[in-house]
Interface confidence: medium
Amino acid sequence: QLFHLQKELAELRESTSQMHTASSLEKQIGHPSPPPEKKELRKVAHLTGKSNSRSMPLEWEDTYGIVLLSGVKYKKGGLVINETGLYFVYSKVYFRGQSCNNLPLSHKVYMRNSKYPQDLVMMEGKMMSYCTTGQMWARSSYLGAVFNLTSADHLYVNVSELSLVNFEESQTFFGLYKL
């Protein structure tokens, strides 16, 4: 899915640059230029773990690596919706530790909007008794579902134990795309 979206964005950039070249050539030759085909930018975001996250909500890498950000804004840990509609929202968090003490783990995706007076939890994952005491361990939590989001909704991710999160870009991420 991610690969396809990246490919689509690349194709879009390519076709846009070709369109500019073609239309300038036509102007020189004197042919009437047909109206450019308007291909709307896909609203999509895929942000990856950022190891300097120090508090909640989690902060995300929005510039380097396998990151996508198109038609959606990133602001202080949150993805900001600018167009009402149906979105698939997802997040994966990779927890691990050297010595298991079965601390309860939670992973939430929640929403804020100035039109609503408190945070609204959209998705939540909880883990308890997930490892053998004293042993090295690792566990992933994946959340994903479709939501009707409104312009100005801010989406965030929260975890209960920040120190147990592995921020590798392939392991911990947060994203969405408009259907």
């Epitope: 909007n113 039109k115 609503y116 007076p117 408190q118 939890v121």
Partner: antibody, heavy 118, light 109 residues
Framework: QIQLVQSGPDLKKPGETVKISCKAS????????MNWVKKAPGKGLKWMGW????????SYAEEFKGRFAFSLETSAGTAYLHINNLKNEDTATYFC???????????WGQGTSVTVSS | QAVVTQESALTTSPGETVTLTCRSS?????????ANWVQEKPDHLFTGLIG???NRAPGVPARFSGSLIGDKAALTITGAQTEDEAMYFC?????????FGGGTKLTVL
């Protein structure tokens, strides 16, 4: 389906305390704030304030600061209204009202009648 | 403290369209007042109809709609039914508190 079930009517003397409960079901309790509204006999509706069911932080309308308190028992999905040092003018029906995703008061409890009389 | 004013009573007939309004003493009602409309039936049975000016609450029939008309908030019932006979209250948000109107008694004859 979503329901807000309030405790039964109460008859109190001036100076006493009353605790009204509001048991929520059919939705995630901690996602939606809870408002409290007063309706005195022959009078209109008055918004008393609300409590953030996520953080437990209450917010009171100016008129209801002091003797009134909101609290939660999150594990039971229950909100409470406490009124201390009851006065005759506290005689009213009190409603808990759920916020929806927007600033909207969508579901109302059936109301709890409190009569303060010596 | 702001005062919110509604028509004290309105009468309509089944199938007719009726509009109830809600005025603010502080000036024009805007979307920032997040106008709410609530229906009260006998025995203190309250139901939220509209929130945030025009968002219908779950399960509320499509004949109820909210809007801003001029400087007021409005509740329109398109094709009123006998069961719509009730008291209707509007509530407006003023930065940090709600103020309710006095209510409109709607009769459907």
């Amino acid at each position: 389906q979503i329901q807000l079930v309030q405790s039964g009517p109460d008859l109190k003397k001036p100076g006493e305390t009353v605790k009204i409960s509001c048991k929520a079901s059919g939705y995630t309790f901690t996602n939606y704030g809870m408002n409290w509204v007063k309706k005195a006999p022959g009078k209109g509706l008055k918004w008393m304030g609300w409590i953030n069911t996520n953080t437990g932080e209450p917010s009171y309308a100016e008129e209801f600061k002091g003797r009134f308190a909101f609290s939660l028992e999150t594990s039971a999905g229950t909100a409470y209204l406490h009124i201390n040092n009851l006065k005759n003018e506290d005689t009213a029906t009190y409603f808990c009202v759920k916020y929806s995703r927007y600033y909207a008061m969508d579901f109302w409890g059936q109301g709890t009648s409190v009569t303060v009389s010596s | 403290q702001a005062v919110v004013t509604q028509e004290s009573a309105l009468t309509t007939s089944p199938g007719e369209t009726v509009t109830l309004t809600c005025r603010s003493s502080t000036g024009a009602v805007t979307t920032s007042n997040y106008a709410n409309w609530v229906q009260e039936k006998p025995d203190h049975l309250f139901t939220g109809l509209i929130g945030d000016t025009n968002n219908r609450a779950p399960g509320v029939p499509a004949r109820f709609s909210g809007s801003l008309i001029g400087d007021k908030a409005a509740l329109t019932i398109t094709g009123a039914q006998t069961e719509d006979e009730a008291m209707y209250f509007c509530a407006l948000w003023y930065s940090n508190h709600w103020v309710f109107g006095g209510g409109t008694k709607l009769t459907v004859l």
